[in-house]
């Protein structure tokens, strides 16, 4: 007989799990960089752009050695989940201005969807503990301008594209410890 | 220009340590991973590891894990990778490479520096 | 770690004549819609120069005559007619897990 009703169910090979989570990660962070080149060819911005409401970096070099796989997955999930918010804001917020980047920005948006459902699976397949349902963000700010836009576009691909590098080193740094 | 330019030549004794160093220039440096990649004679290229600018963070193949150190140095854009404990084995060109986030394929190469190690 | 074998190790053919490359992995490389494969091109006293990357994308500056294709464990550089600046040494490289490794290499010589 399986698990009982509710539990989770414990995966026989959580290194493959991972493995699988990684190679999705890399998809996504090949996606981006893509879709980053896109922008900065039709969209050039100079200089780093920052964007207040998205997730600040989640680790240094340093804090990456004592990382946790229950700590990885939870700040991973809840970035991703920041930005999925953010790529759904963009293309909400600046349809017409951005529209050379579709489906570019669908695609992107459909994979970052499926890796966090593919962290939530993880989660529950390594029988951690589940995080109670985020509370409502506050509503993201229109652009005050289409450049305002732009810029912000530049922002969010940037910060995902780093958070997506750091995401495959961790999680491939925990493989080794499993 | 994107550019990748090494420190020269080496010679060293067994035992002894080697520092290389890799200035990058024509690109933000912080947007990319720096590699490092082996080229002994008469053998297969071969991956050291890679170091993210922005958070540190090397990776290591494991073959080398103990013996190579990766560090950057942002404000100078430069790489650098020692290799301790060094044995006649090691003598090769060393190469830092320009690789895309999380990736491991290498655009942009340094001119290589060549190590010897020779008692 | 994957292994990658190169063949031939070594190919003989005039300028104008079309070269086929051929790099074998010892497991998938291929997942989550790309394929973890790229080729370069070393010259003797250079370093390698990235051609193709991700199994089939010509990388910038890269003349269009350098195509790559396959999937799974089977891949192909293709040089569609050769130049006398293509003779050289290829090498294939994988980045499907860590660590990435190489192939052996062909040698690209002029008959």
């Known amino acids: 007989p399986g698990p009982p009703p509710g539990s989770p169910r414990a995966s026989p090979d959580p290194r493959a799990e991972l493995d699988s989570t990684v190679l999705l990660t890399r998809s996504l962070l090949e996606d981006t960089r893509q879709l980053t080149i896109q922008l900065k060819d039709k969209f050039p911005a100079d200089g780093d752009h920052n964007l207040d409401s998205l997730p600040t970096l989640a680790m240094s070099a340093g804090a990456l050695g004592a990382l946790q796989l229950p700590s990885v997955l939870t700040r991973l999930r809840a970035d991703l989940l920041s930005y999925l918010r953010h790529v759904q804001w963009l293309r909400r917020a600046m349809g017409s201005s951005l529209k050379t980047l579709e489906p570019e920005l669908g695609t992107l948006q459909t994979r970052l969807d499926r890796l966090l459902r593919r962290l939530q699976l993880l989660m529950s397949r390594l029988a951690l503990p589940q995080l109670p349902p985020d509370p409502p963000a506050p509503p993201l700010a229109p652009p005050s301008s289409t450049w305002g836009g732009i810029r912000a576009a530049h922002a969010i691909l940037g910060g995902l594209h780093l958070t997506l590098d750091w995401a495959v080193r961790g999680l491939l740094l925990l493989k080794t410890r499993l | 220009e994107v550019q990748l330019v090494q420190s020269g030549a080496e010679v060293k004794k067994p035992g002894a340590s080697v520092k290389i160093s890799c200035k990058a220039s024509?690109?933000?440096?912080?947007?990319?991973?720096m590699d490092w990649v082996k080229q002994a004679p008469g053998q297969r290229l071969e991956w050291i590891g890679d170091?993210?600018?922005?958070?540190?963070?090397?990776i290591y193949n494991q073959k080398f894990t103990g013996r190579a150190t990766l560090t950057v140095d942002k404000s100078a854009s430069t790489a650098y990778m020692e290799l301790s404990s060094l044995r006649s084995e090691d003598t090769a060109v060393y190469y830092c490479?320009?690789?895309?986030?999380?990736?491991?394929?290498?655009?942009?190469w340094g001119q290589g520096t060549t190590v010897t190690v020779s008692s | 770690d994957i292994v990658l074998t190169q063949s031939p190790a070594s190919l003989a053919l005039s300028p104008g004549e079309r070269a086929t490359l051929s790099c074998r992995a010892s497991?998938?490389?291929?997942?989550?819609?790309?394929?973890?494969i790229h080729w370069y091109q070393q010259k003797p006293g250079q370093a390698p120069r990235l051609l193709i990357y991700?199994?089939?994308n010509l990388e910038s500056g890269v003349p269009a005559r350098f195509s790559g294709s396959g999937s799974g464990t089977d891949f192909t550089l293709t040089i569609s007619s050769l130049e006398e600046e293509d003779f050289a040494t290829y090498y294939c490289?994988?980045?499907?897990?860590?660590?990435?490794?190489f192939g052996q290499g062909t040698k690209l010589e002029i008959k």
């Open positions: 490289q994988h980045s499907r897990d860590l660590p990435p490794t």
């Open positions: 991700l199994a089939s």
């Open positions: 170091i993210n600018p922005t958070i540190g963070a090397p």
């Open positions: 497991k998938s490389v291929s997942t989550e819609g790309y394929s973890y």
């Open positions: 024509g690109y933000t440096f912080t947007d990319y991973n």
């Open positions: 490479a320009r690789g895309a986030l999380a990736h491991w394929y290498f655009d942009v």
